[in-house]
């Protein structure tokens, strides 16, 4: 199934995907699309590049902002909404028949915490908390069931207050989703 | 408005060779993936083979792998299926219709017997 | 391959009043469904896609639901011209498959 992530409306939401072009430099096309990775294609295109470049997208919201030519396909939403939420489809299109590497990844985006934190305190949920718990893009990360998540004793520095991690964290537990942390 | 013509069907003896053709107008053809649906007489819809956009990958039901091949030229704003070794159990009305995965819209049909 | 199940065969309903038809997949298709409607001697029409997406042109009385394996199509007020064969259609697994139909008659 599927690896959570997680963004407040408003803010940017980060969806790691990634290959090793083989050899360098060897880019293959690829498509992001709003619903679980179908037999062929993407559904519903949120962005397609070709072996160059970015050649369709259907919003100025989406962006690849990583390393397009070394791989780094992880797709940017700015500014999300509710809306946003679901399941997209990174679709890596290998040449060959059914060769393509589909990751079907999944968004979460949650409405601003009500309490106001400290000016001091970084806010930005959907560039630092995504990649928080789930670093998709840096090599494998530790998986913890919902049962295994910390309560309110989750120290993150200069990020986020208490209430709002004891918060989110309930809600992850009660949505029965598995975090990957850092 | 987008419309496909489907042409080609007809009684054809069993090991027999028949070529369909859907002719497209009213969108981009070559932006699209286009595919052939069949139903047989009385019976359920069966997805039949794909063309990707540019004709660079096909696909087909492992009933019709190997006789069977789907073809498409953007110039003529047409997509073929070339039918050969053609059984009994191939009678059906073969639908041209856009799209991979689901499709919309698609062609009235033609009908492939295939009878001794 | 996905087997597709649609229930009932055969549904008689009046018009006027609601139909609702279902369709079972043997493994999860997530929401990659469509709903297709054939009248007699005619070709298909998509109806519904990503099982709840409704296709342009297509009557707001049409809706579809459900993710996973268990999905319905629900007509909610039938109209003289609904009464026909509506399919289902998986496209997350390979091969593409349809279900066996569901034929909807006047009561």
């Known amino acids: 199934s599927e690896v959570e992530y997680i963004a407040e409306v408003g803010q940017n939401a980060y969806l790691p995907c990634s290959y090793t072009p083989a050899p360098p430099g060897n880019l293959v096309p690829v498509c992001w699309g709003k619903g679980a990775c179908p037999v062929f294609d993407c559904s519903n295109v949120v962005l397609r590049t070709d072996n160059r470049d970015v050649n369709d997208r259907t919003s100025g919201r989406y962006w690849l902002k990583g390393d397009f030519h070394k791989g780094d396909v992880s797709l940017t939403i700015e500014n999300v909404t509710l809306a946003d939420s679901g399941v997209y489809c990174c679709r890596i299109q290998i040449p060959g028949i059914m060769n393509d590497e589909k990751h079907n990844v999944k968004l979460v985006v949650i409405k601003p915490a009500k309490v106001t934190p400290a000016p001091t305190l970084q806010r930005d949920l959907t560039s630092a908390f995504p990649r928080m718990l789930t670093t998709g893009e840096h090599g494998p990360a530790e998986t913890q069931t919902p049962g295994s998540l910390p309560d309110v004793n989750l120290t993150v520095s200069n990020f986020f207050c208490e209430l709002q991690i004891f918060t989110l964290t309930n809600e992850l537990r009660d949505s029965g989703a598995t975090i990957r942390t850092a | 408005e987008v419309q496909l013509v489907e042409s080609g069907g007809g009684l054809v003896q069993p090991g027999g060779s028949l070529r369909l053709s859907c002719a497209a107008s009213?969108?981009?053809?070559?932006?699209?993936?286009m595919s052939w649906v069949r139903q047989a007489p009385g019976k359920g819809l069966e997805w039949v083979a794909n063309i990707k956009r540019g004709g660079s990958e096909r696909y087909y039901v492992d009933s019709v792998k190997g006789r069977f091949t789907i073809s498409g030229d953007n110039a003529k704003n047409s997509v073929y299926l070339q039918m050969n070794s053609l059984r009994a159990e191939d009678t059906a009305v073969y639908y041209c219709?856009?799209?991979?995965?689901?499709?919309?819209?698609w062609g009235q049909g033609t009908l492939v017997t295939v009878s001794s | 391959e996905t087997v597709m199940t649609q229930s009932p065969a055969i549904l008689s309903v009046s018009p006027g009043e609601r139909a609702t038809l279902s369709c079972r997949a043997s493994?999860?298709?997530?929401?990659?469904l469509a709903w297709y409607q054939q009248k007699l001697g005619q070709a298909p029409r998509l109806l519904i896609y990503?099982?709840?997406t409704r296709a342009t042109g297509i009557p707001a009385r049409f809706s579809g639901s459900g993710s996973g394996t268990e999905f319905t199509l629900t007509i909610s007020s039938l109209q003289s011209e609904d009464f026909a064969v509506y399919y289902c259609?998986?496209?997350?697994?390979?091969?593409?498959?349809f279900g066996q139909g569901t034929r909807l008659e006047i009561k």
């Open positions: 990503d099982a709840s």
């Open positions: 009213g969108f981009t053809f070559s932006s699209y993936w």
């Open positions: 259609q998986q496209y997350n697994n390979w091969p593409i498959t």
């Open positions: 493994q999860s298709v997530y929401s990659n």
């Open positions: 219709a856009r799209g991979s995965n689901w499709f919309d819209p």
